[in-house]
Amino acid sequence: GITIPRNPGCPNSEDKNFPRTVMVNLNIHNRNTNTNPKRSSDYYNRSTSPWNLHRNEDPERYPSVIWEAKCRHLGCINADGNVDYHMNSVPIQQEILVLRREPPHCPNSFRLEKILVSVGCTCVTPIVHHVA
Amino acid sequence: GITIPRNPGCPNSEDKNFPRTVMVNLNIHNRNTNTNPKRSSDYYNRSTSPWNLHRNEDPERYPSVIWEAKCRHLGCINADGNVDYHMNSVPIQQEILVLRREPPHCPNSFRLEKILVSVGCTCVTPIVHHVA
């Protein structure tokens, strides 16, 4: 891996759990200054593999609200507006990091957790398995 | 919001920066036990809105490696395998949380950062604006 020269102004790290337990500033820095605030907000309806967005709320997690996509159909919408089952709607999934309160209900102690979320759907040509 | 009863076993939070600065255990808990290791790995090629994946590496960020999707075409692939410009390939984007080393090069001090990543692409019907 890449060796990072240590900054002499770093906080003390004599904690016996170091480097597993670190200090994190929750004052979020948002790098998305040049992005479209609308973003993919209407793509879920206009896509040939449309999806619905479901709110997943968990007060023990940070962020507490995550939006999950569910594909509306197994097939994809064709030019006539009908579902074509010769094509497949599939979820585009991504592993994301969240903070889980640990011990539970603690306001200032967390553990990193990796969860799989579905961000939207895309239309793919199916893989056909033939009987031998 | 939801009021969470405080666990009496929580770590001490007398830090002057509380609640902005919290302790985080980096020993990641992976909730994806029931997920498909294949996941969307071949969708980028089989999609009607295919994409390429670009590696974005930053040693000052955790996770240091993030994969970014870039749509291959402006249009979508039709049944004949050609690009149809009457449809649009668009990126599906998601805001994710990452940890940014702060101060820089510190191994045990981070700040939460929100970044926008493209996870894949989907094919949408374009919005047609008619000249008045």
């Epitope: 594909c71 497949n88 599939v90 | 029931n34 498909n36 294949k38």
Partner: nanobody, 119 residues
Framework: QVQLVESGGGLVQPGGSLRLSCAAS????????MSWYRQAPGKERELVAT????????NYADSVKGRFTISRDDAKNTVYLQMNSLKPEDTAVYYC????????????WGQGTQVTVSS
């Protein structure tokens, strides 16, 4: 037309076994995570087992872990549920469908197959 047809249910004594089949038609299942669900009288439908596309991995409800096994044969467009060491509380109508975590599944439910565990 998309159809999911479940079969293989029946009356079995506690400790017995059954193998359920789910034949899909009208679409190719290979890309889809498939699941078995069950609904007992007066109760909500619950997830029993899931198998990911390509059979990458499986997941089970705690109540059936170690007793039930989900599998798939994409060439036959069919999903199976092998049920061993059956208990009276397994009595329900069993359905297969795509995984409702990733898909809106309301349009695709079949008739299901009745499993009754009784002595």
């Amino acid at each position: 037309q998309v159809q999911l047809v479940e079969s293989g249910g029946g009356l079995v004594q506690p400790g017995g076994s059954l193998r359920l089949s789910c034949a899909a038609s009208g679409f190719i299942i290979s890309d889809f995570p498939m699941s078995w669900y069950r609904q007992a009288p007066g109760k909500e439908r619950e997830l029993v087992a899931t198998i990911t596309s390509a059979g990458g991995s499986t997941n089970y409800a705690d109540s059936v872990k170690g007793r039930f096994t989900i599998s798939r044969d994409d060439a036959k467009n069919t999903v199976y549920l092998q049920m061993n060491s059956l208990k009276p509380e397994d009595t329900a109508v069993y359905y297969c469908n795509v995984d409702w975590k990733w898909y809106e599944v309301d349009d695709y439910w079949g008739q299901g197959t009745q499993v009754t565990v009784s002595s």
